[in-house]
Interface confidence: medium
């Protein structure tokens, strides 16, 4: 229903705390360089204004759209052009073009320092002094680094953060209480960020229909007892929520997500038997819980998929009558029978089925033509199954760090033109799939592996789009989202690449590496590994292993030496010589 004042409506629906959090996230995602204090001031002004509209919906400017109100605030920031360059040009436009312009200027890789966690005592002190400001800083720092982070989910992570600090800051050993818990939240939040970015990419590049297909497959897997109309209702609502968040309409997004959670909990009987535990939780936890709820038990008496979609004499008639609904039904029926498949695979199968009907229904004997379609799915299913087996076997043999290195070599060979920091980030993220998925039961591995890899590769594509350097990457990133992962997997060594000349300084290290945290040490070593592959793209695994073992030994020796600096300056050049010889 239409409201006189949109801002008053959202403030009333969301409550002050969530309203302020969401406005802060919105501003931080649009203007990623501004300080927390600058944004906090704007948020307070917007909140005060919202309160005046709650008191009197007819007050001046209360009838303006949220985009207009927020855009006017952002455009009033002093020194906008100095700090943001051409983003300031957005302010010359009218809505809705102005908001579109802001969205286009969101930076997926802002040049901000990594978000450093203060040490435990300092963190607890500032948290106790002012929990609201502390959490505001958290929202601001995450949102500006992840401009497409799913806003209501970020509120959930902030709530988790808050609960951990409340608990751990009361303990004697704050550090050992905080570190593992906050590391866990950080890991989950980073995965949430790349997953959501993938959803926004799907929406931006291929439109609502593509996202809705993704949602139908995912929901059908989770809720196999819900009927097709129920699944499409949920998919339609979920598409709206995600469209709003991806479009920067964070208040509407959070409000509609709460509505969807409420609907699901009120209609458990027609959706799933597994929702009750989630529905007993408060709002943010409830919505989060529903988004990752376990799959309902599949109905025992499901007929073979072939009955409706291959053997039925009316297949072409049903398809012609309403293509979208017929294909949607196919996707629903296939997905509910296969919780063990990835959504990407299910969408590839639906695409294959559609292409088969398009071809066969135009022929003289359609049933003879489409009669083998399910058999033709086999290679499409085998490919990701083999990928999972091969990679999980490798992960089990090498462990996470070794597995990351194997992926780093593989991807540097596929796309050696890509910058080393991007390759290292991608390989480290891709390598985490082992820890995340390979330990799961067999029937959960494929969906976990492939859908996670797809999300990571989407980030590779986004970063590559900014500065395209590899034809291989451009080729894989230009196709449909669901074909990307198979495309990257199929890439081989880039034969067009001219190897980088050997630069000794690339492989020169100093004693400061010894005091780095383990993660930073790994990144330094992986940077060297990528550079080695760029120098010798056809180096064998054995050659690279020899060099990396030597390198690890060198670091170990010099970091234990009494005079570290001398060790590095004398042994370093010897290492470089040995590396060149080993790769000759």
């Amino acid at each position: 229903e239409a409201h006189k004042s949109e801002i008053a409506h959202r403030y009333n629906d969301l409550g002050e705390q969530h309203f302020k959090g969401l406005v802060l996230i919105a501003f931080s995602q649009y203007l990623q360089k501004c300080s927390y204090d600058e944004h906090a001031k704007l948020v307070q002004e917007v909140t005060d204004f919202a309160k005046t509209c709650v008191a009197d919906e007819s007050a001046a400017n209360c009838d303006k759209s949220l985009h207009t109100l927020f855009g006017d605030k952002l455009c009033a920031i002093p020194n906008l052009r100095e700090n943001y360059g051409e983003l300031a040009d957005c302010c010359t436009k009218q809505e809705p073009e102005r908001n579109e312009c802001f969205l286009q200027h969101k930076d997926d890789n802002p040049s901000l320092p990594p978000f450093e966690r203060p040490e435990a005592e300092a963190m607890c002190t500032s948290f106790k002094e002012n929990p609201t400001t502390f959490m505001g800083h958290y929202l601001h720092e995450v949102a500006r680094r992840h401009p497409y982070f799913y806003a209501p989910e970020l509120l959930y992570y902030a709530e988790q953060y808050n609960e951990i600090l409340t608990q751990c800051c009361a303990e004697a050993d704050k550090e050992s209480c905080l570190t593992p818990k906050l590391d866990g939240v950080k890991e989950k939040a980073l995965v949430s960020s790349v997953r959501q970015r993938m959803k926004c990419s799907s929406m931006q590049k291929f439109g609502e229909r593509a996202f809705k297909a993704w949602a139908v497959a995912r929901l059908s897997q989770t809720f196999p007892n819900a009927d097709f109309a129920e699944i499409t209702k949920l998919a339609t609502d979920l598409t709206k929520v995600n469209k709003e968040c991806c479009h920067g309409d964070l208040l509407e997004c959070a409000d509609d997500r709460a509505e969807l959670a409420k609907y699901m909990c009120e209609n458990q009987a027609t959706i799933s038997s597994k929702l009750q535990t989630c529905c007993d939780k408060p709002l943010l936890k409830k919505a989060h819980c529903l988004s990752e709820v376990e799959h309902d038990t599949m109905p025992a008496d499901l007929p073979a998929i072939a009955a409706d979609f291959v053997e039925d004499q009316e297949v072409c008639k049903n398809y012609a009558e309403a293509k979208d609904v017929f294909l949607g039904t196919f996707l629903y029926e296939y997905s509910r029978r296969h919780p063990d498949y990835s959504v990407s695979l299910l969408l590839r199968l639906a695409k294959k089925y559609e292409a088969t009907l398009e071809k066969c229904c135009a022929e003289a004997n359609p049933p003879a033509c489409y009669g083998t379609v399910l058999a033709e799915f086999q290679p499409l299913v085998e490919e990701p199954k083999n990928l999972v087996k091969t990679n999980c076997d490798l992960y089990e043999k090498l462990g996470e760090y070794g597995f990351q290195n194997a992926i780093l070599v593989r991807y540097t060979q596929k796309a050696p033109q890509v910058s080393t920091p991007t390759l290292v980030e991608a390989a480290r993220n891709l390598g985490r799939v082992g820890t995340k998925c390979c330990t799961l039961p067999e029937d959960q591995r494929l969906p976990c592996v492939e859908d996670y890899l797809s999300a990571i590769l989407n980030r590779v594509c986004l970063l590559h789009e900014k500065t395209p350097v590899s034809e291989h990457v451009t080729k894989c990133c230009s196709g449909s989202l669901v074909e990307r992962r198979p495309c990257f997997s199929a890439l081989t060594v880039d034969e067009t690449y001219v190897p980088k000349e050997f630069k000794a300084e690339t492989f020169t290290f100093h004693s400061d590496i010894c005091t780095l945290p383990e993660k930073e040490k790994q990144i330094k070593k992986q940077t060297a590994l990528a550079e080695l592959v760029k120098h010798k793209p056809k180096a064998t695994a054995e050659q690279l292993k020899t060099v990396m073992d030597d390198f690890a030994q060198f670091l170990d020796t010099c970091c234990k030496a009494a005079d570290k600096d001398t060790c590095f300056s004398t042994e370093g050049p010897n290492l470089v010589t040995r590396c060149k010889d080993a790769l000759a």
């Epitope: 007892n225 009927d227 097709f228 109309a229 129920e230 499409t232 209702k233 339609t236 609907y263 209609n267 009987a269 027609t270 109905p299 007929p303 409706d308 039925d312 009316e314 049903n318 609904v325 017929f326 039904t329 629903y332 029926e333």
Partner: nanobody, 119 residues
């Protein structure tokens, strides 16, 4: 026992309108998606429109999109089909059906109501 009773059919000129109703009983109507299907003389069953238990979303066969509107009143356990700009090819017996788990298999339907479009 599930009962579905359609009404509202009749003879109408091309371009005219009709509103079909379907009274439902014997099951929980407000948790069931519903649909209209039709059968033209000498032809097979053709689905026309589907409506979710809450009233949205709705789906239409391409042949009726923009002309027909499906709706429901859960307080009255009644399903409706508003048919505008009727054409000769809309002539058929219209059945309301309880929506099952599979799109093209219908669990229960009524005895139907005949719609004839002719000048």
């Amino acid at each position: 026992e599930v009962q579905l009773l359609e009404s509202g059919g009749g003879l109408v000129q091309p371009g005219g309108s009709l509103r079909l109703s379907c009274a439902a009983s014997g099951f929980t109507f407000d948790t069931s998606s519903m649909l209209w299907v039709r059968q033209a003389p000498g032809k097979g069953l053709e689905w026309v429109s589907v409506i979710h238990q809450s009233g949205t979303p709705t789906y239409y066969a391409d042949s009726v999109k923009g002309r027909f509107t499906i709706s429901r009143d859960n307080s009255k356990n009644t399903l409706y089909l508003q048919m505008n700009s009727l054409r000769a090819e809309d002539t058929a017996v219209y059945y309301c059906a309880k929506f099952p788990s599979s799109q093209f298999r219908f669990d229960y339907w009524g005895q139907g109501t005949l719609v004839t479009v002719s000048s």
